[in-house]
């Protein structure tokens, strides 16, 4: 039950995270005009990964796409790439994790296969989250660098008389959405990996054999040995618990596959 809950929760958290990464990637407010300590203008500028927008006080908003590919800064291209990789990996991870969910029965899929798929999707979610966090962080670093550069020459004098105000940009809402979404995807991925450990078959169970020692009649059941943690391990001799009741011999200190949270 705990494994199913962990896996389900990991899936849901990752789903929310990936939805957030997609939202952040599409959002226009990656960088917004810094209003602090700036002359009050009737125009508000903000920029995304794909287009830049201008909102006028009168109520009109105009957005222009970046129709060039080669003319864009390499850092922006890198951020785009990281976000897209994050989305693609996350989407594949979601697809894989759907089939890996313990609560969903697909034919006669064995636990080892589900464990494999859970681990795969977990790793994909982790990498997806890291890509998003990295992308957002690279963009944020770029903003910070540009911010202080533009602060250094906030006003560029023209002939000593006329002043040109340089627009400074600060963190937009998309950065925070991206960080949170990346974090959630990462957490979801970790949860999937934890769930995978619980899904993996942990015991190789042999049929009970009676050994007759001289003078004693003791039945010895070698049931407490752990199976290999390799995902392709034999699962044909699975122990079937009836209502969780165990014989005295079966009570052991080793964790069973139901003990992982």
């Amino acid at each position: 039950m705990a494994v199913t809950a962990c896996q389900g929760l990991g899936f849901v958290v990752s789903l929310i995270g990936i939805a957030g990464i997609i939202a952040a990637t599409c959002m226009d407010q990656w960088s917004t005009q810094d209003l602090y300590n700036n002359p009050v203008t009737a125009v508000f500028n903000y920029q995304g990964l794909w287009r830049s927008c201008v909102r006028e006080s009168s109520g009109f908003t105009e957005c222009r796409g970046y129709f060039t590919l080669l003319g864009l800064p390499a850092m922006l291209q890198a951020v785009r790439a990281l976000m897209i990789v994050g989305i693609v990996l996350g989407a594949i991870g979601l697809l894989v994790s759907i089939f890996a969910l313990k609560c969903i029965r697909i034919g006669s899929m064995e636990d080892s296969a589900k464990a494999n798929m859970t681990l795969t999707s977990g790793i994909m979610f982790i990498v997806s989250g890291l890509c998003a966090i990295a992308g957002v962080s690279v963009f944020a670093n770029m903003l910070v660098t540009n911010f202080w550069m533009s602060t250094a020459n906030m006003y560029t004098g023209m002939g000593g008389m006329v002043q040109t105000v340089q627009t400074r940009y600060t963190f937009g809402a998309a950065l925070f959405v991206g960080w949170v979404a990346g974090g959630l995807t990462l957490i979801g991925g970790v949860m999937m990996c934890i769930a995978c450990r619980g899904l993996a078959p942990e015991e190789t169970n042999y049929k009970a054999v009676s050994y007759h020692a001289s003078g004693h009649s003791v039945a010895y059941k070698p049931g407490g040995f752990k199976a290999s943690t390799g995902f392709g391990s034999n699962t044909k001799n699975k122990k079937i618990y009836d209502g969780g009741a165990r014989t005295e011999d079966e009570v052991q200190s080793y964790p069973s596959k139901h003990d992982y949270v």
């Epitope: 203008t41 009737a42 927008c53 201008v54 006028e56 009168s58 109520g59 009109f60 006329v162 627009t167």
Partner: antibody, heavy 117, light 113 residues
């Protein structure tokens, strides 16, 4: 079609408060801003202030302490209140709709306000 | 506040001639976000409210004759009437629509010779 109509008292005593209402039609105050401009007889235009779609306001810095602009979206009305009037406030007061580039694309006919005792 | 300076204060031209008036702002009205200049030109005929001619320094308002054109960028702007007509007799105002508070120039009066 877009229309703006100012309604004012015409004559106001010095030190009193002027209240002008601009009733608009043909557009919504939740979508577009309204700006106020005045013109003393025989002189140039002076921007007074504006109330934007979201309800935020901006004022002429020289008149800020005396000016209040508010609106009632449901009644499609914008009001301008100016306190402590002097003879220098005698002017035609216009309201205008904000358009592209923050320009005023539609204007009311204006209302003449005379400050005199 | 931004100071808008218009020149000349009055301009007399013959019908059919070209009229050019200037407007200078104390700060650049160019917005880097969309590369547009937030300068507006208005025409005010005697006894009438002002009428919008040009916004974004060079974009003609719909219904405005194409003999009116705006140019310039940053701090220096020009309104040109390619062939003056009798109905163009008016005062022309430029306005800063970028920095609050918005400010008008003192106006250029166009007269017919």
């Amino acid at each position: 079609q877009v229309q703006l109509k100012e309604s004012g008292p015409g004559l106001v005593a010095p030190s009193e408060t002027l209240s002008i209402t601009c009733t608009v039609s043909g557009f919504s105050l939740t979508t577009y801003g309204v700006q106020w401009v005045r013109q003393p007889p025989g002189k140039g235009l002076e921007w007074l202030g504006a109330i934007w779609a979201g309800g935020n306001t901006n004022y002429n810095s020289a008149l800020m302490s005396r000016l209040t602009i508010s609106k009632d979206n449901s009644k499609s009305q914008v009001s301008l209140k100016m306190s402590s009037l002097t003879a220098a406030d005698t002017a035609i007061y216009y309201c205008a709709k904000g358009g592209y580039g923050n320009a005023m694309d539609y204007w009311g006919q204006g209302t003449l306000v005379t400050v005199s005792s | 506040d931004i100071v808008m300076t218009q020149s000349p204060s009055s301009l007399a031209v013959s019908l059919g001639e070209r009229a050019t008036m200037n407007c200078k702002s104390s700060q650049s009205l160019l917005n880097s976000g969309n590369q547009k200049n937030y300068l507006t030109w208005y025409q005010q005929k005697p006894g009438q409210p002002p009428k919008l001619l040009i916004y974004w320094a060079s974009t003609r308002e719909s219904g405005v004759p194409d003999r009116f054109s705006g140019s310039g960028s940053g701090t220096d702007f020009t309104l040109t009437i390619s062939s003056v007509q009798a109905e163009d007799l008016a005062v022309y105002y430029c306005q800063n629509d970028y920095f609050f508070p918005f400010t008008f120039g003192q106006g250029t009066k166009l007269e017919i010779k």
